[in-house]
Interface confidence: medium
């Protein structure tokens, strides 16, 4: 995410437009407590981080409260008074939405509608992936709201589903992170299952009426 300066690599993640996590990897300063200084506007004074992340007893990152901010984080990583990495980044471009909550499934014959709670901000895609043991890879469908209908399912098959949220690239840019996946949920004949058999079970013979 930023080029290295004096051997410093940084990573920024803006968790759900709530908390910004900046972490650094500085091989040259691996046994040094680097300090993190930041501001949210170009003309403010720098504040020092009050919530450091530690790795092997040394500072390796900072967590910042930054709720619903659409502005720039100016920051400087320092060794004492000497800046080893200074940059400015648009925080929203490193958005990682939270994992979908209250995921529900509504079945109607060969279709299922997957819903969950929409996040409080927009320009997101809600992606449902699903597969049966007969499928070699996950199928995917996504919508602008968490209301995704998947049609053409086989009621006799067991399907695994999971859901995640992605930031729209044309708004947030290409450096965002998808949310973590929701828990996998398994369904067959409109009923929840503990799991789908890894090996496909042979289809039951149809009884003639």
């Amino acid at each position: 995410q930023g080029g290295a300066a004096e051997g410093v690599q940084i990573q920024i993640i803006y968790f759900n437009l709530e908390t910004v996590q900046v972490t650094w990897n500085a091989s040259k300063y691996s046994r040094t407590n680097l300090t993190f200084h930041y501001r949210f506007n170009g003309d403010e004074a720098y504040d020092q981080c009050t919530n450091y992340l530690l790795q092997e007893g040394h500072t390796s990152g900072c967590l910042l409260d930054a709720e619903q901010r659409d502005d720039i984080l100016y920051f400087s990583i320092r060794n004492g008074t000497h800046p080893v990495f200074t940059a400015s980044r648009w925080m929203v471009y490193y958005l990682k939405p939270s994992s979908p909550k209250h995921v529900r499934f509504s079945w109607h014959q060969d279709a299922v509608t997957v819903t969950c709670s929409d996040l409080s901000y927009g320009d997101l895609l809600y992606e449902v992936q699903y597969r049966s043991p007969f499928d070699t890879e996950w199928q995917s469908k996504q919508e602008n709201t968490c209301n995704v209908t998947i049609e053409g399912l086989d009621a006799e098959k067991c399907y695994s589903f999971w859901v995640r949220v992605k930031a729209m690239e044309d708004v947030y840019g290409p450096d965002t992170y998808p949310s973590d996946w929701s828990e996998v949920t398994c369904w067959q004949r409109g009923e929840i299952r503990d799991a789908c058999a890894e090996t496909p079970t042979p289809p039951k013979p149809k009884l003639s009426k």
């Epitope: 080029g3 502005d71 940059a87 400015s88």
Partner: antibody
Framework: QVLLKQSGPSLVQPSQSLSITCTVS????????VHWVRQSPGKGLEWLGV???????DYNAAFMSRLSITQDNSKSQVFFNMNSLQSDDSAIYYC??????????WGQGTSVTVSS | DIQMTQTTSSLSASLGDRVTISCRAS??????LNWYQQKPDGTVKLLIY???RLHSGVPSRFSGSGSGTNFSLTITNLEEEDIATYFC?????????FGGGTKLEIK
């Protein structure tokens, strides 16, 4: 179709202010910010500042003391104001739609001459 | 501020040629590099963003490459409508800065 249409004066007196309006269509100012850039023969293209979709601004430090960018979302207009103009502020001024690290659509430009 | 340098200020080529325009950044800007085309009438259009991504509607004869400090824009099979000035711009750190431009002319 994304369009940015600029309107403003072509001649400004030295020490006076420059005001340019950028009227946008095809996108919402509540969703995308707008940048301002100028181009002069002597200094090439210079980034002047940006107004975010939230209405907050960031300015090039070289112009911060005399630059103001505001917007009216309901009218889809962004207003650029620079005061204390001198002859070396003569340039073509552009507004441009912001999309992450880039300006993906530009206005037609406003050619401004500072002269008495 | 990050300085962007386009060492070639003007370039002459024939229709159908392959043309490469280079741009150098004074420090590492990762891949946050964009290319713009300015026509003689002043109209500015985005061609390539994020070093190599083609903006919508831009012909595939345009391509971009590079990372860190060295970048290039390539036009294959040069056409008459490509006569313009090309600018690079870094979007890594404020203030955003531009190269001085490369004016492309037909031989």
């Amino acid at each position: 179709q994304v369009l940015l249409k600029q309107s403003g004066p072509s001649l400004v007196q030295p020490s006076q202010s420059l005001s340019i309006t950028c009227t946008v269509s095809g996108f919402s100012l509540s969703r995308y910010g707008v940048h301002w850039v100028r181009q002069s023969p002597g200094k090439g293209l210079e980034w002047l500042g940006v107004i975010w979709r939230s209405g907050s601004t960031d300015y090039n430090a070289a112009f911060m003391s005399r630059l103001s960018i505001t917007q009216d979302n309901s009218k889809s207009q962004v207003f650029f104001n620079m005061n204390s103009l001198q002859s070396d502020d003569s340039a073509i001024y552009y507004c441009a739609k912001k999309a992450f690290y880039v300006m993906d659509y530009w206005g037609q430009g406003t050619s401004v001459t500072v002269s008495s | 501020d990050i300085q962007m340098t386009q060492t070639t200020s003007s370039l002459s080529a024939s229709l159908g040629d392959r043309v490469t325009i280079s741009c150098r950044a004074s420090q590492d800007i990762s891949i946050y590099l964009n290319w713009y085309q300015q026509k003689p009438d002043g109209t500015v259009k985005l061609l390539i963003y994020y070093t190599s991504r083609l903006h919508s509607g831009v012909p595939s004869r345009f391509s971009g490459s590079g990372s860190g400090t060295n970048f290039s824009l390539t036009i294959t099979n040069l056409e008459e409508e490509d006569i313009a000035t090309y600018f690079c711009q870094q979007g890594n750190t404020l203030p955003w800065t531009f190269g001085g431009g490369t004016k492309l002319e037909i031989k």
